[in-house]
């Protein structure tokens, strides 16, 4: 579960800022990339690279852009309508159980197991028992075969919320 958006996640807009475009709300809502003014009369654009909004909304503030952590690479920048897309660096992955950090992928499979899945930004290498074909779970014994993983593959986000 993502954390509740708190006040510090919101980026207050300076109402008088000349670079911020304004338009009128449509039935009380402002389009993605904007937030509503306090008096409800205007839609004020989010600041590129600083904050964003993804949906038609009546938010008083745009949402603050995520900064990628060390160990992550920026896959795509924060725009006025999208948050930053962060991805674990090559050779590391993000687990559902510990989404706060990228963990190093294992370098190979334990003896008696074969590699059937590579290290990806969202999963460790996948090992199965040679005979049964059942997946390995849990800690890896110290002795490993020389089956090494090849990082690679489509991008996956590290940071899923603003």
């Amino acid at each position: 579960e993502s954390a509740l958006i708190t006040q510090q996640d919101l980026a207050p807009q300076q109402r008088a800022a000349p670079q911020q475009k304004r338009s009128s709300p449509s039935e009380g809502l402002c389009p993605p990339g904007h937030h509503i003014s306090e008096d409800g009369r205007d839609c004020i654009s989010c600041k590129y690279g600083q904050d964003y909004s993804t949906h038609w909304n009546d938010l008083l503030f745009c949402l603050r852009c995520t900064r990628c952590d060390s160990g992550e690479v920026e896959l795509s920048p924060c725009t006025t309508t999208r948050n930053t897309v962060c991805q674990c660096e090559e050779g590391t992955f993000r687990e559902e159980d510990s989404p706060e950090m990228c963990r190093k992928c294992r370098t190979g499979c334990p003896r008696g197991m074969v590699k059937v899945g590579d290290c990806t930004p969202w999963s460790d290498i996948e090992c199965v028992h040679k005979e049964s074909g059942t997946k390995h779970s849990g800690e890896v014994p110290a002795v490993e075969e020389t089956v090494t993983s090849s990082p690679g593959t489509p991008a996956s986000p590290c940071s899923l919320s603003g």
Epitope: E1, S2, A3, L4, I5, G28, L29, P32, T54, H55, W56, N57, D58, L63, T66, L75, S76, R82, N83, T84, V85, P154, A155, P157, S159, L160, S161, G162
Partner: antibody, heavy 122, light 107 residues
């Protein structure tokens, strides 16, 4: 683990109002991180997004259905509801509620309710 | 509205086959595309987002690619549990729209 469950009558008469409720468990609708959507699937398998609601009560509807749709939220019950007025046989579909992970980098629907079939017939 | 067109509408394949499904948007949607898998009587299951990123727990035999208007979902080695209908969905603008679906059937 967030789970969603639709409930409501499976049979509605033409010209009447279809009413469905989605109950969310394992997470709070009041989290500002999500929008809450209704999606329907016609017998011919086409999926159609109906609209969403935010915990604050702000809504946005598919323009093709806007004149007939109302989505509301009851945060105290952790539920949101769909009303579709003046229904015809063309509104016969499986109706799904889904969470829209839309306050982050992406917009996708996950998880979904199991769906409820609503037949419009006299 | 952005129209999403999938092809083929159905494909017959065997276990172990490589299967490719394409999705075309009527206008550019950058990489804001998701893929879902649906089995009969079940809700769609979310597979891929931002065109190429796998949802946690989705097998690595699934992959997505593309940007702009043309996108591809590939299943590298079809497994028995992969026989289903697959849908693409654009998340570039409102209203959100889906492709008409591609049914992957047993040959």
């Amino acid at each position: 683990q967030v789970q969603m469950q639709e409930s409501g009558p499976g049979l509605v008469k033409p010209s009447q109002t279809l009413s469905l409720t989605c109950t969310v468990s394992g997470g709070s609708i009041s989290s500002g991180d999500y929008y809450w959507s209704w999606i329907r699937q016609h017998p011919g398998k086409n999926l159609e997004w109906i609209g969403y609601i935010y915990y604050s009560g702000s809504t946005y509807y598919n323009p093709s259905l806007k004149s007939r749709v109302t989505i509301s939220v009851d945060t105290s019950k952790n539920q949101f509801s769909l009303k579709l007025s003046s229904v015809t046989a063309a509104d016969t579909a499986v109706y799904y509620c889904a969470r829209d992970n839309g306050s982050g980098s992406y917009d996708w629907f996950d998880p979904w309710g199991q769906g409820t079939l609503v037949t419009v017939s006299s | 509205d952005i129209q999403m067109t999938q092809s083929p509408s159905s494909v017959s394949a065997s276990v172990g086959d490589r299967v490719t499904i394409t999705c075309r948007a009527s206008q550019g949607i950058s990489s804001w595309l998701a893929w879902y898998q649906q089995k009969p009587g079940k809700a769609p299951k979310f597979l891929i987002f931002v065109a190429s990123s796998l949802q946690s727990g989705v097998p690595s035999r699934f992959s997505g690619s593309g940007s702009g208007t043309d996108f591809t979902l590939t299943i590298s080695s079809l497994q028995p549990e992969d026989f289903a209908t697959y849908y693409c969905q654009q998340a570039n603008s409102f209203p959100r729209t889906f492709g008409q679906g591609t049914k992957v059937e047993i040959k």
